[in-house]
């Protein structure tokens, strides 16, 4: 999970002749808010999840009013930063799609209007928790100039936000496999339900045991870096088992233009001329208002007074899809290894791990003897999450450190006598009986019961339990 | 305790198909790729291909592309692998295995042993 | 296809020794290796992954390393349950790819 952050510098008449009229006038003063709209770069986007990486909205500028006889200069901007959270992997290639909208603020009846100044849009590849990266885009005779990153929500770090930190278990070391967490070096990495073995920096996964790698690595666990020299075309997704760049579709293949909406190539992309009730990038917005209440389980509805503007609903924690529709229920993925309990907490997923099992879905088994020493020669016994130790004779407890009594426990049968020794206890039997516990009766015949007394050893004789 | 069953035993005549099927009990069968890797008399270990149960994603040896198909039935928690035109040299001891929790095979099935002979 | 050779086909040793089997991969596997013990009429058994971590339930007396193109497995004190053949497989690239055996009898 993390946050794609976008920060607007300016807004205004771009170079060369035929500079735009300012938006605003003394009659008709108005105020520019930002709309963004992500989507993965690779991902094969449904009509229905317009923004599949998310959307916001900023909030609204200062009023402007244009000074007659002025050239449009720079537009007054919001304040602060669009934010985007993403709850999954960060794609690494993504495409946004920027809109410019002017509220304007005259006396018209019903309020404020809406009407969509610019939009820009484009395709990008970038790594979560790099630097800020600046760009200029023209839309007509409009210029855009933003910076944008991607950064992760702890406790999840990496180029695609995958990698989760914990605090660590052990004062000195990680579970098998999993490194210091950089810059938490007190913390460890541990993976999520992708495949195991699934490359943290470069895999990612959608669905429990996957793992899809970002554009350039290819392979079973994403380790492989993605090789065009014996390819014939530099386009298109890796194949999985040659690691080669294969021709892929053109811009048009496949028509991404969403409800019935035409395409149409162009130089680097393509173009949707869209049917009545429809716009954005992909013909993917329809006409419906924030009035016809399309946000479902509480979900917020923001824009969209009229028709010719679109909505975006804000879902609650537990819900998403573009009109909140879809609940999430993380836990019915049993992410919690080792029978650890799932806890959705709508911001995050916490396991409760049983004993002797650690990491964030309880996926370590402890070494539950690691650094446990047994005092006095006792040997540590791991199971079930809980080590103990195997005393020597003469001492028990947790950790053998106490001196056991041996005859506490009443060893001798038959009223024999218990003497403590170094080596354990000594029982001294009764008349006729017998054995190292006095167990053994003595036949009349002098024969006794089995096992037989070893050589030496006269029935009576005290018999050290060794 | 992760358990996967295997078919029993199986004698084909050279070109046809024989279908083996691998049950899975004892975890969430969905989120672990099952893998198929077979082993003729006296040889070693050969990998055919995986599958992940919980999107019905396969990936092939490109060996066997042309005559494999792997699938699933959720509802059963069990996976089929198919191998059609069926030569001498496919006698063999097929085994499924999942990919654990550790990047490995961690769990192996009994093993099916498919005779091809006319 | 990335193939995996085993060192030595045959290995004959006695309870209490030390053996060491090798395994080389023909390209950079980095430690995307794991390795099988394989007893006669018997389906393999998980020992090792990412070249040195023990699999749950596997003695001490098994150890991995390596990584690249060269790897091993060690057993430090031969028992009489370890008489077995032993496969060596990567799984860094499709197709995964089994090294040929290397089967351990009693001298």
């Known amino acids: 999970a993390g946050v794609f952050e976008l920060q607007i510098h300016s807004f205004g008449p771009g170079p060369g002749p035929g500079a735009p009229r300012s938006p605003c006038s003394a009659r008709l003063p108005c105020r520019l808010f930002f709309r963004v709209c992500l989507k993965p770069g690779l991902s094969e986007e449904a009509a229905e999840s317009p923004c599949a990486l998310g959307a916001a909205l900023s909030a609204r500028g200062p009023v402007y009013t244009e000074q007659p006889g002025a050239p449009a200069p720079d537009l007054p901007l919001p304040d602060g930063l669009l934010q985007v959270p993403f709850r999954d992997a960060w794609p690494g290639t993504f495409s946004f799609i920027i809109e410019t909208w002017r509220e304007e603020l005259g006396d018209q009846i019903g309020g404020p209007a809406w009407s969509l100044l610019a939009r820009v849009a484009g395709r990008r590849r970038l790594a979560a928790g790099g630097p800020w990266a600046r760009d200029i885009q023209r839309a007509g005779a409009w210029e855009l100039r933003f910076s944008y990153r991607a950064r992760c929500e702890p406790p999840a770090v990496g180029t695609a936000c995958t990698r989760l930190c914990r605090p660590r278990s052990a004062p000195s070391r990680c579970g098998p496999g999993l490194r210091p967490c950089a810059p938490l070096e007190d913390e460890c990495e541990a993976p999520l339900v992708c495949r195991a073995g699934c490359s943290p920096e470069h895999g990612f996964c959608e669905q429990p045991g996957e793992c899809r790698c970002l554009e350039g690595w290819t392979g079973p666990l994403c380790t492989v870096p993605v090789s065009t020299s014996s390819c014939l075309s530099p386009r298109g997704p890796s194949s999985a088992t040659t690691g080669c760049l294969v021709p892929g579709p053109g811009p048009c293949d496949g028509n991404p233009c969403a409800n019935g909406g035409s395409c149409s190539e162009t130089p680097r992309s393509f173009e949707c001329t869209c049917p009545r009730g429809f716009y954005g990038l992909r013909c993917e917005v329809s006409g419906v208002t924030c009035a016809d209440g399309p946000c479902f389980n509480g979900g917020l509805c923001v824009g969209g007074a009229d028709p010719d503007s679109a909505y975006i609903c804000h879902c609650p924690p537990g819900f998403q899809g573009s009109n909140c529709e879809k609940r999430v229920d993380r836990c019915s993925l049993q992410p919690c290894r080792n029978g650890g309990l799932c806890l959705d907490l709508g911001h995050a997923l916490r396991c409760r791990c049983r004993a002797g099992f650690a990491g964030p879905r309880c996926e370590h088994d402890l070494d539950d003897c690691a650094g446990r020493a047994c005092a006095n020669g006792g040997t540590c016994v791991e199971g079930g999450g809980a080590h103990r130790c195997s005393c020597a004779l003469g001492f028990g407890g947790r950790d053998c450190r106490e001196r056991a009594d041996p005859c506490a426990a009443r060893p001798c049968a038959h009223g024999g006598r218990c003497y403590a020794h170094f080596s354990g206890l000594v029982c001294a039997c009764a008349p006729g009986y017998m054995g190292a516990r006095c167990e053994f009766p003595v036949h009349p015949d002098g024969a006794s019961a089995l096992p037989a007394a070893p050589p030496g050893l006269r029935p009576g004789d005290p018999q050290r339990y060794l | 305790q992760v358990q996967l069953v295997q078919s029993g035993a199986e004698v084909k005549k050279p070109g046809a198909s024989v279908k083996v099927s691998c049950k899975a009990t004892?975890?969430?069968?969905?989120?672990?790729?099952i893998e198929w890797v077979r082993q003729a008399p006296g040889q070693g270990l050969e990998w055919m291909g995986e599958i992940l149960p919980g999107t019905g994603n396969t990936v092939y040896n490109e060996k066997f592309k042309d005559r494999v198909t792997m699938t699933v039935d959720t509802s059963t928690s069990t996976v089929y692998m198919e191998l059609s035109s069926l030569r001498s040299e496919d006698t063999a001891v097929y085994y499924c295995?999942?990919?654990?929790?550790?990047?490995?095979?961690?769990?192996w099935g009994q093993g099916t042993l498919v005779t091809v002979s006319s | 296809d990335i193939q995996m050779t085993q060192s030595p086909s045959t290995l004959s040793a006695s309870v209490g020794d030390r053996v060491t089997i090798t395994c080389k991969a023909s390209q950079n596997v980095g430690t995307n290796v794991a390795w099988y013990q394989q007893k006669p009429g018997k389906a393999p058994k998980a020992l090792i992954y990412?070249?040195?971590y023990r699999y749950s339930g596997v003695p001490s007396r098994f150890s991995g390393s390596g990584s690249g193109t060269e790897f091993t497995l060690t057993i430090s004190s031969l028992q009489p349950d370890d008489f077995a053949t032993y496969y060596c497989q990567q799984y860094n690239s499709y197709p995964f790819t089994f090294g040929q055996g290397t089967k351990l009898e009693i001298k």
């Open positions: 004892d975890y969430i069968f969905s989120n672990y790729y």
């Open positions: 990412s070249a040195s």
């Open positions: 295995a999942r990919w654990g929790d550790y990047a490995l095979f961690a769990n």
